[in-house]
Amino acid sequence: VPLSRTVRCTCISISNQPVNPRSLEKLEIIPASQFCPRVEIIATMKKKGEKRCLNPESKAIKNLLKAVSKEMSKRSP
């Protein structure tokens, strides 16, 4: 569950559940910073624009990131 705060981490809970890359509208990867000491991954789904915080340590999520970056490299000229 994401939560909007300025000087805090965004994610309150995280999911290990894999996400179908085709159902993704957007995938945000927020690097660790002075505001939040951990990497955060926020998936926005096409359906209703629903968001989900993903666990960067989860194997399923790591595979998702690989699949998405593969897809992006295909699209880039």
Partner: antibody, heavy 121, light 109 residues
Framework: QVQLVESGGGVVQPGRSLRLSCAAS????????MHWVRQAPGKGLEWVAL????????YYADSVKGRFTISRDNSKNTLYLQMNSLRAEDTAVYYC??????????????WGQGTTVTVSS | EIVLTQSPGTLSLSPGERATLSCRAS???????LAWYQQKPGQAPRLLIY???SRATGIPDRFSGSGSGTDFTLTISRLEPEDFAVYYC??????????FGPGTKVDIK
Amino acid sequence: QVQLVESGGGVVQPGRSLRLSCAASGFTFSNCGMHWVRQAPGKGLEWVALIGFDGINEYYADSVKGRFTISRDNSKNTLYLQMNSLRAEDTAVYYCARDWPEGYYNGMDVWGQGTTVTVSS
Amino acid sequence: EIVLTQSPGTLSLSPGERATLSCRASQSVSSSYLAWYQQKPGQAPRLLIYGASSRATGIPDRFSGSGSGTDFTLTISRLEPEDFAVYYCQQYGSSPPFTFGPGTKVDIK
């Protein structure tokens, strides 16, 4: 099965302290934000505090800010609420509840049975 | 701080009847952040509806939620004996506090 069990309630004098615990089982506790919610006798529900899955984020209701501290020990699958400077108006049933992570906001989907705190001289 | 108002305070109905419960917010709430709970005497609350209109796991389809902005509704299409309880709405906005409404009691006429 998925379960939350609160403990630590009791009768305490005004100005004293009490620590509540909430033992979680049946799910990946370390992935879930956790809440404390209370209910005074014959009254409605009042959100008290929230802690993020890794303890970085903490949020409090104005009525308890500066007096209550929420914390967690993921190695023990346990949530805590340290309550200091207790007042008569803190008398309530205290529930811990899970913040469900598999969506944007799926509400508090698992609740404990509650533990009763009575502040009285 | 967003304040939630629920109406009516008490709803007296008979089994089989339709119940319509209202929850009004003092300022706009994203529908993603509105939930409904049921509470029976001596029990913990139970999540019924999240995201204003999605039923939680195991909740019968006689329960439905709707609304957006500042006005939200919980509808119980046909009241069963086990549905007589207190119902709370709750908002989970972009920052705490995550306020609950004062509740609507549905009792047997």
